[in-house]
Interface confidence: medium
């Protein structure tokens, strides 16, 4: 799976979209999970309504919401009041039985609020040393990772 980078500004909302084949994934609930390290498990953050027919209803877990357009085939995740610790690697998932298919791998980058001068840095990355390949970007703000670019720079 390619990785799509979504950039948001600290303190603001970030909307992540995950398109999918609505016929292939018909009847399946969806989920948004956070990758714990490149090879680690994906920890569930929020999932769509328990009744698939009600997947269009927005469900919240803390500051993260999820809603699913099951006819159009678009899963939408909203990260409200984006914070530096929200930066990291996530997955949109399609659930079937005890298994989950990855719909999209997402790298969330948090940009500093340009009106907030308390921090000199302008971009927060997850504190991981691992890298991953085949990343590309959609603007939300979003961009493509260049070939060989490391989304998780080594921590000093």
């Amino acid at each position: 799976h390619n990785t799509t980078v979504f950039q948001g500004v600290a303190g603001q909302s970030l909307q992540v979209s995950c398109p999918y084949d609505s016929m292939k994934h018909w009847g399946r609930r969806k989920a948004w999970c956070r990758q714990l390290g490149e090879k680690g498990p994906c920890q569930r953050v929020v999932s769509t309504h328990n009744l698939w027919l009600l997947s269009f209803l927005r469900r919240w877990n803390g500051s993260t919401a999820i809603t699913d357009d099951t006819l159009g085939g678009t899963l939408t995740i909203t990260l409200r009041n984006l914070q530096p610790h929200d930066a990291g690697l996530y997955q949109c998932q399609s659930l079937h039985g005890s298994e989950a298919d990855t719909l999209r791998k997402v790298l969330v980058e948090v940009l500093a609020d340009p009106l907030d001068h308390r921090d000199a840095g302008d971009l927060w990355f997850p504190g991981e040393s691992e890298s991953f390949e085949d990343a590309h970007v959609e603007h939300s703000i979003s961009r493509s990772l260049l070939e060989g670019e490391i989304p998780f720079p080594p921590t000093s």
Epitope: D21, M23, K24, W26, G27, R28, R29, N50, L51, W52, L53, L95, H96, G97, S98, E99, D101
Partner: antibody, heavy 123, light 112 residues
Framework: QVQLQESGPGLVKPSETLSLTCTVS????????MNWIRQPPGKGLEWIGR????????NYNPSLKSRVTISVDTSKNQFSLKLSSVTAADTAVYYC????????????????WGQGTLVTVSS | DIQMTQSPSSLSASVGDRVTITCRSS???????????LHWYQQKPGKAPKLLIY???NRFSGVPSRFSGSGSGTDFTLTISSLQPEDFATYYC?????????FGQGTKVEIK
């Protein structure tokens, strides 16, 4: 109307590869999961695996996974089964079937089946 | 894998009889989306299986009303309210809640 037709050799030698094709007509081929199922003579049904023609995604029965490949040719409305290193235990009637057309509350059952083709593994 | 167990493995009945076949799964068949993907198929000798009931209790198109399905969780039943001559066949339950899909061993309904 919806039709599925299996084709392929009826006799395969032990240790060789069994190859079957299912040709589909009468509906939007790329939007339903397609399955292979087999039935040894006088026995029950065994699911082999499935493929989604839209993107080629596959799932296999773990008991056969190391020997099975299911592929699709959307230009011909066909999907294929290859089963390697066959033995007499692979002698069966092989069926192709689609999952019930994806409509609200109606998915995940096999509504249309091919008539089946008997494959005998023997030297 | 989910194991499907049918009972009885065979039965003899007469035209007009009420016939009940049971199917038990080794784990719950409730999918994460709330649906239960338990289906029933009918197969006659030399023919491909035909879908009778999908998702526990929904009759497939063209299936006579004498066929009905019920159950939940792990225990399911197929009932033929009044057996007809064309109903003598083998019946299979099947689950598609989880891959790999699995079938029961079949119940053969024979003429008494």
């Amino acid at each position: 109307q919806v039709q599925l037709q299996e084709s392929g050799p009826g006799l395969v030698k032990p240790s060789e590869t069994l190859s079957l094709t299912c040709t589909v007509s009468g509906y939007a081929f790329s939007s339903s999961w397609m399955n292979w199922i087999r039935q040894p003579p006088g026995k029950g049904l065994e699911w082999i695996g499935r493929i989604y023609p839209g993107d080629g995604d596959t799932n296999y029965n773990p008991s056969l996974k190391s020997r099975v490949t299911i592929s699709v040719d959307t230009s011909k409305n066909q999907f294929s089964l290859k089963l390697s290193s066959v033995t007499a235990a692979d002698t069966a009637v092989y069926y192709c079937a689609r999952l019930l057309r994806n409509q609200p509350g109606e998915s995940y059952a096999m509504d249309y089946w091919g008539q089946g083709t008997l494959v005998t593994v023997s030297s | 894998d989910i194991q499907m167990t049918q009972s009885p493995s065979s039965l003899s009945a007469s035209v007009g009889d009420r016939v009940t076949i049971t199917c038990r799964s080794s784990q719950s068949l409730v999918h994460s989306n709330g649906y239960t993907y338990l289906h029933w198929y009918q197969q006659k000798p030399g023919k491909a299986p035909k879908l009778l009931i999908y998702k526990v209790s929904n009759r497939f198109s063209g299936v006579p009303s004498r066929f009905s399905g019920s159950g939940s969780g792990t225990d399911f039943t197929l009932t033929i309210s009044s057996l007809q001559p064309e109903d003598f066949a083998t019946y299979y339950c099947s689950q598609s809640t989880r891959v790999p899909y699995t079938f029961g061993q079949g119940t053969k309904v024979e003429i008494k």
